[in-house]
Interface confidence: medium
């Protein structure tokens, strides 16, 4: 069982490989990689590219094998595949490999970009779309506006970006966005740089995060009604876990997306 010899796909179809709780996790999380074969198997192997021997074996007479990665470190991130085999197959013969599973072990998701489409200057009666773009698919995206503690709009996207439509009359202002994992544990990306939307003739500007002291942090203000929510420039979310890449439809998020928004 050193180098897997892969027969034609018609012989031994590929298994499915998934991660729980997530494909993106913070260091120290326990991750289970589940390999499910389309038929009962005898041995399962977990492979990383460039390594001739399986990283882990599981000898189980069933269709499912679980590989436990305890308290993962960034070094354990990367691409994984699994294969299965049966005792009646020839020596070293494995099934077709599963599709790749990329495990990312990191503290936070990368910063998204925030751009205005068609541009950051709004003409009379025109709407503007803000595109918050990250690097990962199936994330939930949150748009914030300076001076407003609650998220302005919220949506899940199968793409690595989400578009938020602002009505022309209400568009001018300073905006920022995050994206985050779609289900628990919820962890944020770094915040985008702020984007200023202005009326035609006023002139837009893009400002670095530190120069937007009025922008308020995500989350409700503290319970003390007189207290201020911290500014986004001082908000440093930590931690990151991405749940399985499946969108979740939700009943009624608060704040609710506009009626035209397919939403989350």
């Amino acid at each position: 069982d050193i180098t897997p010899s892969v027969p034609p796909a018609s012989y031994h179809p590929k298994p499915w490989l998934g991660a729980q709780p997530a494909t993106v996790v913070t260091p120290g999380v326990n991750v289970t990689l589940r390999c499910r074969a389309p038929q009962p198997a005898w041995r399962f192997g977990l492979f990383k590219p460039g390594e001739i021997a399986p990283l882990l074996f599981r000898d189980v007479s069933s269709e499912l094998a679980e590989f436990f990665l305890e308290e993962v470190t960034p070094a354990q991130g990367g691409i994984y595949r699994c294969c299965y085999r049966r005792p009646d197959w020839g020596p070293g013969v494995w099934s077709q490999p599963s599709d790749v599973l990329e495990l990312l072990v990191t503290e936070e998701l990368p910063r998204p970009s925030l751009v205005a489409l068609p541009g950051p200057v709004v003409g009379p009666g025109a709407n503007v779309s803000l595109r918050c773009a990250g690097r990962l698919r199936n994330m939930s995206f949150v748009l914030y506006r300076e001076g407003v503690a609650a998220p302005l709009q919220y949506r899940h996207s199968a793409q690595p970006w989400a578009d938020f439509t602002l009505l022309g009359a209400r568009a001018p202002g300073t905006y920022s966005c995050y994206y985050h994992t779609p289900s628990a544990p919820y962890v944020l990306s770094q915040r985008s740089e702020v984007l200023v939307i202005s009326w035609e003739g006023e002139g837009p500007e893009a400002r670095p995060a530190s120069s937007a002291p009025g922008m308020q942090a995500p989350g409700p203000p503290p319970s003390d009604p007189g207290a201020q929510a911290p500014s986004l420039s001082s908000f440093r979310p930590r931690g990151l876990v991405l749940q399985p890449l499946l969108p979740q439809t939700q009943d009624s998020w608060d704040p609710a997306p506009p009626p035209s928004d397919p939403g989350v």
Partner: antibody
């Protein structure tokens, strides 16, 4: 291991409000969701809504929209569920629950009995 | 909202027997978002199965879950005295909903 400890039983008059608390200990509070589920005597389970403390975003079941408010205080790792305009059919055990595995509820509070009676 | 129907409403069995509980959804549910809970009188529910087929931490292997789409099954291979309780299925891929429950009682 995360534990959820809820506030004590309440007796309320119809038309009033009740606020139940749920304190989390032993784990990361803000990056998880806290859901509220209720169970009327002899009945099944009914999901009311949830909050994601790190985002300050709430999600309510349509049935309770406008009558329930879920909040969280990250500094004390406590979530709150306030139900207003109480009626007798709101008499139930109210549970807070914490999803650690996908969004299934691994961890439950001990429950808070709320009785609505004139 | 997704409506879950459980059958039978009550299942009367003896210790050592096999219990098969059914949960049917009004529309397709991702198997990643289907869970089963056990509840005993006066106690909070206890998660048994998540993702349709994965056992939660500390759950004995006599409990197993299967199914996809709209039809899901919880099987208890050999009933132990402590297994007599009410069992709920739940979908949590959209606004979460629970089935009405199946009571497993001693024959």
């Amino acid at each position: 291991q995360v534990q959820l400890v809820q506030s004590g039983a309440e007796v309320k008059k119809p038309g009033s409000s009740v606020k139940v608390s749920c304190k989390a200990s032993g784990g990361t509070f803000s990056s998880y969701a806290i859901s509220w589920v209720r169970q009327a005597p002899g009945q099944g389970l009914e999901w009311m809504g949830k909050i994601i403390p790190i985002l300050g975003i709430t999600n309510y079941a349509q049935k309770f929209q406008g009558r329930v408010t879920i909040t969280a205080d990250k500094s004390t790792s406590t979530a709150y569920m306030e139900l207003s305009s109480l009626r007798s059919e709101d008499t139930a055990v109210y549970y807070c629950a914490n999803p650690l595995t996908f969004d299934a509820f691994d961890i439950w509070g001990q429950g808070t009995m709320v009785t609505v009676s004139s | 909202e997704i409506v879950l129907t459980q059958s039978p409403g009550t299942l009367s069995l003896s210790p050592g027997e096999r219990a098969t509980l059914s949960c049917r959804a009004s529309q397709s549910v991702s198997s990643s978002y289907l869970a089963w809970y056990q509840q005993k009188p006066g106690q909070a529910p206890r998660l048994l199965i998540y993702g349709a087929s994965s056992r939660a931490t500390g759950i004995p292997d006599r409990f197993s879950g299967s199914g996809s789409g709209t039809d899901f099954t919880l099987t208890i291979s050999r009933l132990e005295p402590e297994d007599f309780a009410v069992y709920y299925c739940q979908q949590y891929g959209s606004s979460p909903t629970f089935g009405p429950g199946t009571k497993v009682d001693i024959k």
